[in-house]
């Protein structure tokens, strides 16, 4: 029967008595930087070309016995997970292996850097189709390794890496912390985070998604027909590399940004038990388990968006946090979040010719996060309209006044230390969808975009009594671009998007009286692109 991990990533329409999805990734080459591998194993023979690249440190210990099958174990298994005939994800993908890990599974930053440079030079000498680079390794944070990954990604290569097996914040490790890399955590057959001894999968905002990574059956280097079960984020990353190969084989022109958005979009949502993660990491960690798209074509009409969290600002009074979108993505909205509730809001601002989302800490606050909503919107022309704090008691307002521009997000930022100490404004008039409204002491920022066929609408959900969390979701066919809380509530910790749902979090209700100040309203801006829908119909 089909192994659990292949069943998990396979949409129901492909689930026959064996796993045989349409194209097997045959147009894609996957580079594997790992241990040596047994390339003539029955599961992968003819699929893996062992390059002559080898850069590994000496094995530790004078009594270390180099046993060939052990040296090949990790890499052989991963090659089998990516492209194995019977237990592989992308059965048609061809692979090239580079040896950067020794027989004990240890490598160096310099060895990995030289390996990445080898790939870059190979690509220049002999350009092939789409390339996926699988980095099933994790070491301490390295600025230089992250920079090398960024260079390769900007040359059009898709890099997939293991989040790491340290039961820790993936942002503390490289290449997991490189924003351009697709970073993968591991889940088990119950869709729970993988525990490995006293440790387990890494987590946090640097993880893009999770994938099967426990009891994964794959090629064993013990013999040419053997299989073995292995666990870890390396196995999870190998699944995503295989899925990426399948998607790129079906749509070779996909950019890294498009691929990442599709991986997120087609993932299983909200199936992971977040209680496994440390409390402060739960909101930052994506609740996503990778899956193949139900159809390898026809996804182009959707407006894809993802949520990007910044690093924590730190607690100093003037501390700020910045969240950035990838080069090919548009920042459509910006929000902020603070566990203490002490923040001075957020704003979108230009930095290096691109909009970024900046959140501001407040005096006495423990720090803030900036949350960017990053979307794929071809031919978009977006700008930020700002209204300074208003004199009138009705509060501050700003709208999209340019012809053809629609509102995709609202942000507010204030100079006073805590708006909670100020009298809230009266509620603003309803039915003005192209308008952002805020406290009179706040400056309000509207994200206004023009793109062919783009249409947006505002959706609100208000709860009169205090609630720790209020949500509002966009309906089928619409994509959440903006998420904010209505002004007038003193205890809001912040707002953020989770998939297609806008979440507004408040302080513990036990500390808040149920006055009118206790009311919480979540505001979602939901958009769709008729232009993308028409374009995809013409292609079919």
């Amino acid at each position: 029967s089909i192994p659990w991990n292949l069943e998990r990533i396979t949409p129901p329409r492909y689930r026959a008595d064996e796993y045989q999805p349409p194209d097997g990734g045959s147009l894609v080459e996957v580079y594997l930087l790992d241990t040596s591998i047994q390339s003539d194993h029955r599961e992968i023979e003819g699929r893996v070309m062992v390059t002559d690249f080898e850069n590994v440190p000496e094995e530790d210990g004078t009594r270390f016995h180099r046993q060939a099958s052990k040296c090949d174990s990790h890499g052989t298994h991963l090659a089998g997970v990516v492209s194995g005939r019977d237990a592989g994800v992308a059965k048609g993908a061809s692979m090239r292996s580079l040896r950067v890990l020794n027989c004990q599974g240890k490598g160096t930053v310099s060895g990995t850097l030289i390996g990445l440079e080898f790939i870059r030079k190979s690509q220049l000498v002999q350009p092939v189709g789409p390339l996926v680079v699988l980095l099933p390794l994790a070491g301490g944070y390295s600025r230089v390794l992250n920079a090398a990954c960024q260079r390769l990604a900007r040359a059009g290569v898709v890099l997939v890496t293991a989040a790491g097996n340290f039961r820790d914040d993936a942002c503390l490790y490289s290449p997991a912390s490189a924003p351009e890399v697709i970073t993968v955590g591991a889940t088990n057959a119950q869709d729970q985070p993988v525990t490995l001894g006293t440790l387990g999968t890494n987590f946090g905002r640097c993880v893009d998604l999770f994938a099967p990574g426990e009891d994964i059956i794959g090629a064993s280097s013990d013999c040419s027909t053997c299989f073995v079960s292995q666990s870890g984020t390396s196995q999870a990353a190998a699944h995503v590399a295989g899925i990426a190969a399948m998607m790129l084989s079906a749509e070779p022109e996909l950019t890294l940004a498009e691929l990442r958005q599709r991986l997120i979009h087609f993932s299983a949502k909200d199936v992971i038990n977040e209680a496994w993660f440390p409390e402060d990491q739960r909101v930052l960690t994506p609740n996503l388990v990778a899956a193949l798209p139900p159809s390898t074509h026809g996804a182009g009409w959707q407006l894809f968006c993802r949520t990007v969290w910044s690093a924590h600002s730190g607690p100093t009074r003037m501390a700020t946090a910045v969240a950035r979108c990838a080069p090919d993505e548009e920042l459509l909205s910006c929000s902020s979040f603070s566990r203490s509730g002490k923040r001075r809001g957020e704003r979108m601002e230009a930095q290096g010719g691109k909009l970024v989302c900046r959140a501001h800490n407040a005096f006495g606050g423990e720090g803030v996060y900036a949350i960017a909503r990053c979307c794929l919107l071809p031919q978009a022309n977006c700008s930020v309209h700002t209204a300074p704090p208003a004199e009138a008691s009705m509060g501050t307002r700003v709208h999209c006044h340019q012809q053809g521009h629609v509102l995709t997000g609202c942000s507010s930022h204030w100079e006073v230390e805590d708006l909670g100490t100020h009298k809230p404004p009266v509620l603003r008039p309803r039915g003005q969808p192209n308008q952002c409204v805020g406290h009179r002491e706040a400056s309000i920022h509207a994200s206004c975009c023009h793109a062919p066929g783009l249409e947006c609408k505002v959706k609100e959900h208000g709860i009169p009594a205090p609630q720790e969390q209020v949500t509002v979701a966009c309906e089928e066919g619409w994509t959440l671009t903006g998420c904010s809380a209505l002004p007038g509530t003193s205890h809001v910790l912040g707002a953020y998007a989770v998939d297609n749902t806008c979440v507004v979090r408040s302080r513990d209700v036990s500390t808040t009286g149920s006055t009118s100040e206790g009311a919480v309203t979540a505001v979602a801006i939901c958009c769709r692109s008729r232009h993308l829908a028409q374009a995809s119909q013409e292609l079919q």
Epitope: S39, D40, R42, G46, K91, S224, T225
Partner: antibody, heavy 115, light 109 residues
Framework: EVQLVQSGAEVKKPGASVKVSCKAS????????ISWVRQAPGQGLEWMGW????????NYAQKLQGRGTMTRDPSTSTAYMELSRLRSDDTAVYYC????????WGQGTTVTVSS | ESALTQPASVSGSPGQSITISCTGT?????????VSWYQQHPGKAPKLMIY???NRPSGVSNRFSGSKSGNTASLTISGLQAEDEADYYC?????????FGGGTKLTVL
């Protein structure tokens, strides 16, 4: 061009040994092992075993255990199949083929065991 | 391992389609995606026609197709031609080795 070229025909007496060679060219040797298959006159194909060009590991069919030895010499890109204690029912055409997938075959070597 | 079961012979007229079956068990045909089909003309080495159940090597006519259901694999030849007359063998992985079918003689009438 991917090619497997086998040694010439052999006539052996019962109890003797025979060693058939198979020289591979036109591909990355370590990406595939070599399978050995035999076909007795008027009979079907029988898989005998496999040898790795990568590390010399072998995988023998149960029927052959103890009588067959498969080796390889990477320096000459050649794989070998030696069959000992020959019997008359070992008379067959012996083929080498690339890997377990057996996508490319040698031309065959006829081994006749006769007293 | 015992050989996979194939019909001893099948025949068809030029232009017709024929199907050759290959029955095994869940430990071979049913358990792996790696069923191959070989064509062998008299006095010649076998030639790979289908691999991994349904894939055709480059250079093999698209008149040849493969499929699998449960423990039985099938080779279909459409638009039968005189040069298709040959012996056909199926082959499958087992847990530790490889097993061939007994062979099917195809006669083009």
């Amino acid at each position: 061009e991917v090619q497997l070229v086998q040694s010439g025909a052999e006539v052996k007496k019962p109890g003797a040994s025979v060693k058939v060679s198979c020289k591979a060219s036109g591909y990355t040797l370590t990406s595939y092992g070599i399978s050995w298959v035999r076909q007795a006159p008027g009979q079907g194909l029988e898989w005998m075993g496999w040898v790795s060009f990568y590390n010399g590991n072998t995988n023998y069919a149960q029927k052959l255990q103890g009588r067959g030895t498969m080796t390889r010499d990477p320096s000459t890109s050649t794989a070998y199949m030696e069959l000992s204690r020959l019997r008359s029912d070992d008379t067959a055409v012996y083929y080498c083929a690339r890997g377990y997938g057996m996508d490319v075959w040698g031309q065959g070597t006829t081994v006749t065991v006769s007293s | 391992e015992s050989a996979l079961t194939q019909p001893a012979s099948v025949s068809g007229s030029p232009g017709q389609s024929i199907t050759i079956s290959c029955t095994g068990t869940s430990s071979d045909v049913g358990g792996y995606n790696s069923v191959s089909w070989y064509q062998q003309h008299p006095g010649k080495a076998p030639k790979l026609m289908i691999y991994e159940v349904s894939n055709r090597p480059s250079g093999v006519s698209n008149r040849f197709s493969g499929s699998k259901s449960g423990n039985t694999a099938s080779l279909t030849i459409s638009g039968l031609q005189a040069e298709d007359e040959a012996d056909y063998y199926c082959n499958s992985y087992t847990s530790t080795s490889m097993v061939f079918g007994g062979g099917t003689k195809l006669t083009v009438l």
